[in-house]
Interface confidence: low
Amino acid sequence: TPWSLARPQGSCSLEGVEIKGGSFRLLQEGQALEYVCPSGFYPYPVQTRTCRSTGSWSTLKTQDQKTVRKAECRAVRCPAPVSFENGIYTPRLGSYPVGGNVSFECEDGFILRGSPVRQCRPNGMWDGETAVCDNGGAGYCSNPGIPIGTRKVGSQYRLEDSVTYHCSRGLTLRGSQRRTCQEGGSWSGTEPSCQDSFMYDTPQEVAEAFLSSLTETIEGVDAEDGHGPGEQQKRKIVLDPSGSMNIYLVLDGSDSIGASNFTGAKKCLVNLIEKVASYGVKPRYGLVTYATYPKIWVKVSEADSSNADWVTKQLNEINYEDHKLKSGTNTKKALQAVYSMMSWPDDVPPEGWNRTRHVIILMTDGLHNMGGDPITVIDEIRDLLYIGKDRKNPREDYLDVYVFGVGPLVNQVNINALASKKDNEQHVFKVKDMENLEDVFYQMIDESQSLSLCGMVWEHRKGTDYHKQPWQAKISVIRPSKGHESCMGAVVSEYFVLTAAHCFTVDDKEHSIKVSVGGEKRDLEIEVVLFHPNYNINGKKEAGIPEFYDYDVALIKLKNKLKYGQTIRPICLPCTEGTTRALRLPPTTTCQQQKEELLPAQDIKALFVSEEEKKLTRKEVYIKNGDKKGSCERDAQYAPGYDKVKDISEVVTPRFLCTGGVSPYADPNTCRGDSGGPLIVHKRSRFIQVGVISWGVVDVCKNQKRQKQVPAHARDFHINLFQVLPWLKEKLQDEDLGFL
């Protein structure tokens, strides 16, 4: 919504509209105003006022219709539990201050499910989950609980029994008013909550809830079998290879949105497309903007609608001015445009229609002011897709409607009515402003914390070194009276770090090996170091080769599972399903095809990560895998101890990749402390490890300072991971990496 601080163009005076303890800003070219309070405060009695045709602002009325003379900022408080079954809560207050706690305890014989202690947050919402006291014998379904602030009617939980929820006057119900106990022991719909007008979802909450719901739709994991009565079943869907997914992006372009918010919404959707592509799913996109009339920019039936880059290009080319002349808000017509894309000619359903999942993502600042109630179109869409008709197969998984309400004018009842309601999921979101929504989608694409996606980084100006290289591990081996060896490594799974074998000797004890990740000071406990069985540094001593680095790879197994986060995340390994998805290749991609994609017979742009003066920096190099490969490998003869070697293939085996030199560009070189670190190919915004740094021809890092000028024969050699895959596959078989 565009904020204008000029005098309203309407006829309402600004005299006397001030709010005590806060400020106001004008919306809709002065036809409305929003009161703004500091964090932890909310505008009382209303958040917005409209300029009436009489030339006066709408009156300040409380929820019980009393008129107030002057608006004020009041401290946010969280609602008290209306009732709590089979237990007690303390302290018992009428409402709770921000930061205040409420604790729940159960009567004898009942077990607490949910959060025993909940804290009131600055947005007026409680943290944690609904506390329920259950004795396990309630019925076919478990007790659905009473979310704080709601009232529940119904206490029978047999199959097909229903419970209904109500909110106190002045509060709006979000979620399902009625929930029914279903086959399998789950409750229909989504948990309700009572919302005050000042309550907004925080970007973190929205990102988490939206992502977790969206991934339920697109992750493609089997639902677990054997859910007994009362067990919560998570919605997990098998993406049938013959099935598909359509995502309809519907964007409000009415005049109340404003140009900058429209641009912001476009950014959000671009990030969403990127995010979905990163899962390896290739949905078809429909793209609609609307005001008085809808405009379809991309139809799902178009050949390129599944090309994420092309759809992004179309999205970027949309101009806010496109709806300038007809700038009402007709959400019904917009959804009818979506319906028209879903329906089929001559009403003859095409083959596979019932295996297509449909996701509608609607972004708006206020919803309809013309055209009638859009909920009727949602009902028509549900009819078309045969959703909710057959009790045995309700097909709810085939339609998800997400609604993002942005700004203070959002009608909570309307957006809640349109959004899908699914157990343990949230489909309706209300955010303060477009910047907040951009934050949501930024976090969503760059954090992806809900998934162990490999090779993802958080590229942001405020990110630390380990945000940008979250896989990077630092290794040091303490050897009494011999000083210590420093190496690098890469996190490849929750239990394993991949590094070079030469960093260790057979005498090194686990306790003398220090590994740290994520820039953390603490060292991780080591269970065991696994060497490649063919590694033997002394293997060719008799042949006059003092050190032989063939198969120079090792895996460090950690005692405790790593907790992935922004600064600790795995790198992608070749020939895994994760890499197939990262490169957005078809699911049928073979290991050989990945190799052709990552290591074609040419100069390949790659990078390694080095530590310079306590800072991690990326160094761009070229793997010589084409016509320069031979000369690169021949330069190994300049390495100390290799000058007598007649046939260089004695030391440079097929296991090595070669970088360095001055062509096509002058490559930076690795240093001793870089050994064991990953050699990485950066593709499609993802990072895939293709090698392990092993040895170099010239020590260009004397005295800890990198020399600027290095000879052309300064080459580096790295173990090619494609050449040690059987070993990696064997050792990492329990790590869920999905080796091809």
């Epitope: 910047e435 934050d439 942001h460 100006r461 405020k462 310079e612 003066e613 306590k614 800072k615």
Partner: antibody, heavy 118, light 111 residues
Framework: EVQLVQSGAEVKKPGASVKVSCKAS????????MDWVRQATGQGLEWIGD????????GYNQKFKGRATMTVNKSISTAYMELSSLRSEDTAVYYC???????????WGQGTLVTVSS | DNVLTQSPDSLAVSLGERATISCRAS??????????MHWYQQKPGQPPKLLIY???NLKSGVPDRFSGSGSGTDFTLTISSLQAEDAATYYC?????????FGQGTKLEIK
């Protein structure tokens, strides 16, 4: 212990230049950005710019661009700020301040008073 | 540039009482989940001293009577129980993007 020690007070004529130094100790000089901030007598704080000592990259407040030059000498862990074409309104205390991981100014020099007077 | 406006310009508070200073930014200082707003204390003849970083984090060594709150564009520095040594000028500063800017300062006196 982190310390930033600045050069002594200077008196300059309008149109001249002044170069203030800031010697850092107690930490790795190249690890953190160094910022320059000034304060006229009885007035507030005004950010001039920052320099990354590792890459010697700079960011300036547009108001000072072209007049202020920030440099470092890594070998002696010292940052410099030179201000040219001085005018009387440049009379102020000039501070160097070291950024922390959160881009806040965690450590400050004691300040250098620069007086511009004819 | 992001203009930071502090209020009030000056205030006098009795010992042991609560003091509150506000800082409003013309543009949001929030990015990547953090609010890049910091608070400093300056006494005459001394350089400023960092009290609060990222809107609400107390710098180690700073007494816990100081606290910061806020998000986006509106921020508050609170001194819960004023001590004699807290008489000083307080500044907010953002580092969301270049150029970094300071508020005009709030002079806090003991009543």
């Amino acid at each position: 212990e982190v310390q930033l020690v600045q050069s002594g007070a200077e008196v300059k004529k309008p149109g001249a230049s002044v170069k203030v130094s800031c010697k850092a100790s107690g930490y790795t000089f190249t690890d953190y950005n160094m910022d320059w901030v000034r304060q006229a007598t009885g007035q507030g704080l005004e950010w001039i710019g920052d320099i990354n000592p590792n890459y010697e990259s700079t960011g300036y407040n547009q108001k000072f661009k072209g007049r202020a030059t920030m440099t470092v000498n890594k070998s002696i862990s010292t940052a410099y700020m030179e201000l040219s074409s001085l005018r009387s309104e440049d009379t102020a205390v000039y501070y160097c301040a070291r950024e922390d991981d959160h881009d806040a100014f965690a450590y400050w020099g004691q300040g250098t008073l620069v007086t511009v007077s004819s | 540039d992001n203009v930071l406006t502090q209020s009030p310009d000056s205030l006098a508070v009795s010992l042991g009482e609560r003091a509150t200073i506000s800082c409003r930014a013309s543009k949001s200082v929030r990015t990547s989940g953090y609010n890049y707003m910091h608070w400093y204390q300056q006494k005459p003849g001394q350089p400023p001293k960092l009290l609060i970083y990222l809107a609400s984090n107390l710098k180690s060594g700073v007494p816990d009577r100081f606290s910061g709150s806020g998000s986006g564009t509106d921020f508050t520095l609170t001194i819960s129980s004023l001590q004699a040594e807290d008489a000083a000028t307080y500044y907010c500063q953002h580092s969301r993007e270049l150029p970094y800017t300071f508020g005009q300062g709030t002079k806090l006196e003991i009543k």
